[in-house]
């Protein structure tokens, strides 16, 4: 009797399953008792003899190329063998790399966690992700693994990963990149600082006097508000970044605390008082302002 | 700033295998995130890329030349080199190696060698 | 492979002209286009990455711009140094491959 081996799939993908039938077209195996055993090069596949013809394998790997047969042995003890069948398990290459953030956006506040997700649409068996950081390709990890997404994590977000990033990914058919994604580090503003500019050392009534408030660090933009014992004199705003003024006609109902408050969206800080005070010098005629 | 030079003879026989290293300086070659390449031209001609080294042994080839092309390194010499094989008078070119930054674009080359293939 | 052709082979043109060569990808390679400046004898030298990185060091008369298929190097007012021959190369797709070269001569 002749023995044959038959795989369905004859040519299978990376990670599908693959049914190994050892058949005898002249003799049903209910004919007699048979235990079969499946081979590939040289080792046996799965549990060894059984009395069933087939094996099932869950998920062929590329690895897993090369040549397989299947024996068959009766109650007599004798063995047929079949022919050696060459199986070919074919890898797909990676296709369609994309890169995507956790939070969705690429915003992310400082402090906070950021993941960047590199994914491929296709592609089987081991994939190598890179993860690079500018178009300059900082290369800031890579993972080789079987699936299809891969992770990067930078656990505490700073001012300095505001960059573009990319992955890429290859599978041993060439590296393909994804897009350029960018991030955006969103930075709450810090404690604002005010200083009062006057024309001279000492203001006088109707004198100009400039208040200026700045937050040092704090995406834009930023709205100002602007403070006189606590009444709101009015706003202004930085669409760029750095500081705001606001210029005020002096009175001598001026005197007093002053304050500033930035705002970015992110939170509000308030600065500390300037107190300015009216003082009479001896002999002058003019009220005169320190601060 | 890194630099490449390309070394090797500049002529090569028929059949024969043609054989050129690259010494990179001011950076090492194990450094991550840059792909070590060959690049050729014609004479008169356009780019042909033939393939890199990078991951400390890892290569990649262009389908086109693949069974006749080995990229090899030498990191304690901070080298990597070029065998191709069965030459032909089609392989004359000018040759060049260069530093692939993140599989996207080379930002250092080589000043190249010209590689006459004639017997 | 991805074919990249490029858009003039070559053009005459005088110093302070502006010069615009184009590249066109066989299918869309996101942003992954660069272009560089080759002189007779000499090697390539990078320009522009990402379809609109410039390089450091290049002049900023120098810009690219362009995603997907059609990508285009801008040389606002050509000098002196700037004939040569430029070619454009993607990355989106291995093997990495280069247009055929737009030469800028002098008229």
């Known amino acids: 009797a002749e023995l044959f081996l038959i795989a369905s799939p004859s040519h299978p993908t990376e990670g599908s399953p693959v049914t190994l039938t050892c058949k005898m077209p002249f003799l049903q195996s209910s004919d007699a008792q048979f235990q079969f055993c499946f081979f590939r090069d040289t080792r046996a596949l799965g549990p060894g003899w059984s009395s069933s013809p087939k094996l099932q394998i869950a998920a062929m790997w590329k690895e897993d190329t090369g040549s397989y047969w299947c024996e068959a042995q009766t109650m007599a003890s004798k063995v047929l063998r079949s022919r050696r069948s060459q199986i070919n398990v074919h890898r797909v290459p990676v296709a369609d790399v994309s890169l995507e953030t956790q939070p969705p956006g690429g915003q992310v506040m400082e402090g906070d966690r950021l993941v960047l997700i590199c994914s491929v649409a296709m592609g089987t068996g081991d994939i190598t992700f890179l993860w690079y950081k500018g178009a300059v390709g900082l290369n800031l990890q890579s993972k080789t693994q079987r699936s299809l997404t891969a992770e990067y994590e930078i656990p505490s977000v700073r001012e300095s990963d505001a960059e573009q990033y990319y992955c890429v990914a290859e599978n041993g058919y060439g590296p393909s990149p994804s897009g350029l994604v960018s991030i955006t580090v969103r930075i709450p503003v810090s404690r604002p600082i005010l200083m009062l500019r006057a024309p001279r050392a000492q203001a006088a009534v109707e004198d100009v006097l400039e208040l200026h408030c700045e937050a040092l660090r704090g995406s834009p933009p930023i709205l100002y508000w602007f403070y006189h014992e606590d009444i709101t004199l009015g706003s202004r705003s930085a669409p760029s970044g750095g500081g705001a003024s606001f210029n005020l006609s002096l009175t001598e109902e001026h005197s007093g605390n002053y304050s500033c408050e930035a705002n970015n969206g992110l939170g509000a800080q308030r600065s500390e008082a300037v107190t300015l005070n009216f003082t009479v010098p001896t002999g002058a005629r003019s009220n005169h302002l320190t601060s | 700033q890194v630099q490449l030079q390309e070394s090797g003879p500049g002529l090569v026989k028929p059949s024969q295998t043609l054989s050129l290293t690259c010494t990179v300086s001011?950076?090492?070659?194990?450094?991550?995130?840059?792909?070590w390449s060959w690049i050729r031209q014609h004479p008169g001609k356009g780019l042909e890329w033939i393939g890199y080294?990078?991951?400390?042994?890892?290569?990649y080839y262009n389908p086109s030349l693949k069974s006749r092309v080995t990229i090899s390194e030498d990191t304690s010499k901070n080298q990597f080199s070029l065998k191709l094989s069965s030459v032909t008078a089609a392989d004359s070119a000018v040759y060049y190696c260069?530093?692939?930054?993140?599989?996207?674009?080379?930002?250092?080359w080589g000043q190249g060698t010209l590689v006459t293939v004639s017997s | 492979d991805i074919q990249m052709t490029q858009s003039p082979s070559s053009v005459s043109t005088s110093v302070g002209d502006r010069v615009t060569i184009t590249c066109r990808a066989s299918q869309g390679i996101r942003s992954w286009l660069a272009w560089y400046q080759q002189k007779p004898g000499k090697a390539p030298k990078l320009l522009i990455y990402?379809?609109?990185s410039l390089q450091s060091g290049v002049p900023s008369r120098f810009s690219g711009s362009g995603s997907g298929t059609d990508f285009t190097l801008t040389i606002s007012s050509l000098q002196p140094e700037d004939f040569a021959t430029y070619y454009c190369q993607q990355a989106n797709s291995f093997p990495p491959t280069f247009g055929q070269g737009t030469k800028v001569e002098i008229k």
């Open positions: 260069a530093r692939l930054v993140g599989v996207t674009y080379f930002d250092c």
């Open positions: 990402a379809a609109s």
């Open positions: 080294i990078y991951n400390s042994g890892s290569t």
């Open positions: 001011g950076g090492s070659i194990s450094s991550g995130g840059y792909h």
